[in-house]
Amino acid sequence: EPHSLRYNLTVLSWDGSVQSGFLAEVHLDGQPFLRYDRQKCRAKPQGQWAEDVLGNKTWDRETRDLTGNGKDLRMTLAHIKDQKEGLHSLQEIRVCEIHEDNSTRSSQHFYYDGELFLSQNVETEEWTVPQSSRAQTLAMNVRNFLKEDAMKTKTHYHAMHADCLQELRRYLESSVVLRRRVPPMVNVTRSEASEGNITVTCRASSFYPRNITLTWRQDGVSLSHDTQQWGDVLPDGNGTYQTWVATRICQGEEQRFTCYMEHSGNHSTHPVPS
């Protein structure tokens, strides 16, 4: 899994008038990390683990960056011509990634009223637009605005790419939290399914980093993919992750089945409780 930093900003307009505030969230490695507190006009860490990433450093840089990006996005929304009556939203999602081979990715996506209409690979400057005519119109509108001051735009987007990666590297380098290894807690439960069958569920929780293998085995051999159900690997709000895998087995054959877990080079097997 690459390390990633994801900015999610939203600005609103009402009856064609762009509202003064903005909403902002930042995710680090898929975990809620920062949000913009509109009352205090400050970037705030999301939970203890986020505070631990920067230790005792202030969040002034993050506050400044989010404020600037919110201002830019409000200006962009003001230039969208087809705003009708009522409430409308413009959302910008920016993601930068550092992969294991040290290669980087950086992308930017614009949504109007929740619909994607423009994406950019920031490193290569390639823009992509969905096929719908509404998306094409919106994209042309926004790109024309961004092109009005080509030099500013060029500088802005390359700086944005560099800044995102620079911030991500800063968090990775300064943080013991992001280099830690937290082994999962594994718990196996059983529940009655239909007559003669039971559903066995294996849950792994509170692990970091995100990469994990969790699978059911019968007599030491992994079951086929289509006989198992997997949950997504989701953040649990504490800077760690959780997931699960379930399968249906015949009652009385529990002893033949084990849950196999592999995480950060360690592995373990877990029996079905009788």
């Epitope: 992969h99 294991e100 290669s103 990715r105 992308s107 690979n121 290569t124 400057e125 390639e126 080509a150």
Partner: antibody, heavy 115, light 108 residues
Framework: QVQLQESGPGLVKPSETLSLTCTVS?????????WNWIRQPPGKGLEWMGF???????KYNPSLKSRITISRDTSENQFSLKLSSVTAADTAVYYC????????WGQGTTVTVSS | EIVLTQSPATLSLSPGERATLSCSAT???????FHWYQQKPGQAPRLLIY???NLASGIPARFSGSGSGTDYTLTISSLEPEDVAVYYC?????????FGQGTKLEIK
């Protein structure tokens, strides 16, 4: 109809600078897209060399970075390649191409590096 | 840089047969930045399939593409004699853009 046409000398001496120009018709190079140089040594595969984008940004293949310059002349709707300190290994067919998924190509020009 | 490896290096099939060409990347690629090209002897390459699965203008429907992440496939459902060419995959996710080494398609 978008067309790209490479031009430049077919023979360059070792240690000299290779210079090629791509003339674009049917589309403005400042409107959109990346404008690329790609080469193919005899009997070998394709190598992306670099591009100048619609905004004027240049990106180069790190394997050539110290020797390559791509520039553009917006008034003539042209972009150019300069490759310095050439050797026999730079002998190839040189193509200019539009885009990121290269949708339009020039027909290619053969450049031989030889004394 | 992302290295693309094509397989097989050479494919020799009869007219009407199905051809499957593979391209594997050393790092994950976004499917919208993955493309296939066809190059016939003495000609410039031409875009065949863009963004993994979209047919370029003028390309017959017997060509199709699929894939995601690190593994991509070009399929020709029923080979025609004019399909003799070298086929290249290419990624535009990161700089430098890179091509596979090519698969040479021959007709028996």
């Amino acid at each position: 109809q978008v067309q790209l046409q490479e031009s430049g000398p077919g023979l360059v001496k070792p240690s000299e600078t290779l210079s090629l120009t791509c003339t674009v018709s049917g589309y403005s190079i400042t409107s959109d897209y990346a404008w690329n140089w790609i080469r193919q040594p005899p009997g070998k595969g394709l190598e992306w060399m670099g591009f100048v984008s619609y905004s004027g940004t240049t990106k180069y293949n790190p394997s050539l970075k110290s020797r390559i310059t791509i520039s553009r002349d917006t008034s003539e709707n042209q972009f150019s390649l300069k490759l310095s300190s050439v050797t026999a290994a730079d002998t190839a067919v040189y193509y200019c191409a539009r885009g990121y998924g290269f949708d339009y190509w020039g027909q290619g020009t053969t450049v031989t590096v030889s004394s | 840089e992302i290295v693309l490896t094509q397989s097989p290096a050479t494919l020799s099939l009869s007219p009407g047969e199905r051809a499957t060409l593979s391209c594997s990347a050393t790092s994950s690629i976004s499917s919208i930045y993955f493309h296939w090209y066809q190059q016939k002897p003495g000609q410039a390459p031409r875009l065949l399939i863009y963004r993994t699965s979209n047919l370029a203008s003028g390309i017959p429907a017997r060509f199709s593409g699929s894939g995601s992440g690190t593994d991509y496939t070009l399929t020709i459902s029923s080979l025609e004699p004019e399909d003799v060419a070298v086929y290249y995959c290419q990624q535009g996710t990161t700089i430098p853009f890179t091509f596979g080494q090519g698969t040479k398609l021959e007709i028996k």
